[in-house]
Interface confidence: low
């Protein structure tokens, strides 16, 4: 007769993990005892367990609670034993040695590999600003054994990094994704991957981009010079800019004090029906946390009793 | 025999700062991942951070993000945690706890200290 | 963030009981679930690992089971040191989270 066997059992840690030890006896050829034993190398012999024909299951006390025999029906040729939650130190070899009668004793070896799945963490690089060069957007880490695979699925452009640390029983990969910051960016995902074989799908972490920003200021209004006239109402300016954090809006008059009736709401100056006295020289100041903008408009207020039109000027500075 | 001790709690105004220890014994303190889990007066654990022995890499509970800072010395086989701004719900028993030796798979957590009260109070 | 669901959040039984209580997650977590007990005053202690092991040192009447999303923590006959609060814990993913705890009492 001969032992079945496998060379490797693969398991995903946490699961039951099957030795299988199958006698193919000729017939009439019975099994007396399997034992089981951990056999790595440099380490003594380390009994599992131990299936007797007569007096059935016997565990050592080391993996009391750990080992058992498959579900019913059973072969009595069949001496299989189930490791039941493995773990990572459970990795190794095992042999099982089968006394049999009357051909005597065999024995067999395989190797037991746990999968430890890996637990990913995102950590997000320093904050992202509009003008800085290549910068740490992200990095993430994954360990597990084998070796779990970091990559990463974004529409960003960008460089990515990988390193490994080997540790006795696992390894621990850390990827980083660098880029160089834009607006566009803006709520774009980054989103990390790792990849395993004890996973049943990918392991994804996202982090949504944030990169801080002023535009440039302009502002609207004095398109058609000519509806800027005494008697005019609802006359308006309104500053354009966008930014991340949104920026706030303050308005000033160069030339003096903002005139009396004139409303500012946010990024809009609101004016009172038209006199000569709210021509002057306007300033738009936007600002965030990252920077500021200004833009200045000339007013100039028209009398329809006089011909000569007048000009504005447009000027917008940072 | 492992031993966890944490040091450093006590009464700090909101807004102020505490550093808290944990000195680490009985065990091989390089080889393991640490955790700060804490508790409020009354209620359930809840998870603060965790430093792997993998350089040092950290992970934080959002709402302590940017306010606490983990470290670990392990020539001194010593575990920190530097809190800033502390709130009035920063207020419990912070224990540190050693992430299980031979289950690098996860984080369970096998052996705690006795914990340290940090009240924050004005 | 995983949420961990334990029910009940409290029971009242007596000595030799059969205790069990209950652990929900709200995504499948495989077995990377933890029991921990904790007596007034003290630190808590690690009962149960990988859903289903017990720890070194820990009662045989203690035990574990489930996988995925639901899992159960039993005391098959409870006795007078028993009495504390339990908590579940999922670390398949970080952050790590508890339950809210169940909260054994005398009868």
């Known amino acids: 007769g001969e032992l079945e066997t496998s060379d490797v059992v693969t398991v995903v840690l946490g699961q039951d993990a099957k030795l299988p030890c199958f006698y193919r006896g000729d017939s009439g050829e019975q099994v007396g005892q399997v034992a089981w034993a951990r056999v790595d190398a440099g380490e003594g012999a380390q009994e599992l367990a131990l299936l007797h024909s007569k007096y059935g299951l016997h565990v050592s006390p080391a993996y009391e609670g750990r080992v058992e025999q498959p579900p019913p029906p059973r072969n009595p040729l069949d001496g299989s034993v189930l490791l039941r939650n493995a773990v990572q130190a459970d990795e190794g070899e095992y042999e099982c040695r089968v006394s049999t009668f009357p051909a005597g004793s065999f024995q067999a070896r395989l190797r037991l590999r746990v999968l430890v799945p890996p637990l990913p963490s995102l950590n997000p690089g320093p904050a992202l600003e509009e003008g800085q060069g290549l910068t740490l957007a992200a990095s993430c880490t994954a360990e597990g054994s084998p070796a779990p695979s970091v990559t990463w699925d974004t529409e960003v452009k960008g460089t990515t990094s990988s390193r490994s640390f080997k540790h006795s029983r696992s390894a621990a990969v850390t990827s980083e994704f660098h880029l160089v910051p834009s607006r566009s960016m803006n709520g774009q995902p980054l989103t990390c991957v790792v990849s395993h074989p004890g996973l049943l799908q990918d392991q994804r972490i996202t982090h949504i981009l944030h990169v801080s920003f002023l535009a440039e200021a302009s502002v609207r209004g004095l398109e058609d010079q000519n509806l800027w006239h005494i008697g005019r109402e609802g006359a308006m300016l309104k500053c354009l800019s966008e930014g991340q954090p949104p920026p706030s809006y303050n308005w000033t008059r160069l030339d003096g004090p903002l005139p009396s009736g004139v409303r500012v709401d946010g990024d809009t100056l609101g004016f009172p029906p038209l006199t000569t006295e709210h021509s002057g020289i306007y300033v738009c100041h936007v600002s965030n946390e990252f920077s500021s903008r200004d833009s200045q408009v000339t007013v100039d207020v028209l009398d329809p009793q006089e011909d000569s039109g007048k000009q504005v000027d447009l000027v917008s500075a940072s | 025999e492992v031993q966890l001790v944490e040091s450093g709690g006590g009464l700090v105004q909101p807004g102020g700062s505490l550093r808290l220890s944990c000195a680490a014994s009985?065990?091989?303190?390089?080889?393991?991942?640490m955790s700060w889990v804490r508790q409020a007066p009354g209620k359930g654990l809840e998870w603060v951070s965790r430093?792997?022995?993998?350089?040092?890499?950290?992970s934080y509970a959002d709402s302590v993000k940017g306010r606490f800072t983990i470290s670990r010395d392990n020539s001194k086989n010593t575990l920190y945690l530097q809190m800033n701004s502390l709130r009035a719900e920063d207020t419990a028993v912070y224990y540190c706890?050693?992430?299980?030796?031979?289950?690098?798979?996860?984080?369970?957590?096998?052996?705690w200290g006795q914990g340290t009260l940090v009240t924050v109070s004005s | 963030d995983i949420q961990m669901t334990q029910s009940p959040s409290s029971l009242s039984a007596s000595v030799g009981d059969r205790v069990t209580i209950t652990c929900r997650a709200s995504?499948?977590?495989?077995?990377?679930l933890a029991w921990y007990q904790q007596k007034p005053g003290k630190a808590p202690k690690l009962l149960i690992y990988?859903?289903?092991s017990l720890q070194s040192g820990v009662p045989s009447r203690f035990s574990g089971s489930g996988s995925g999303t639901d899992f159960t923590l039993t005391i098959s006959s409870l006795q007078p040191e028993d009495f504390a609060t339990y908590y579940c814990?999922?670390?398949?993913?970080?952050?790590?989270?508890f339950g809210q705890g169940t909260k054994v009492e005398i009868k």
């Open positions: 430093i792997d022995t993998i350089g040092g890499t950290s």
């Open positions: 814990q999922q670390h398949y993913t970080t952050p790590p989270t």
């Open positions: 706890a050693r992430q299980t030796e031979d289950r690098s798979y996860g984080y369970d957590l096998d052996y």
């Open positions: 990988a859903a289903s």
């Open positions: 995504q499948g977590i495989s077995s990377y």
């Open positions: 009985g065990f091989s303190f390089t080889n393991n991942a």
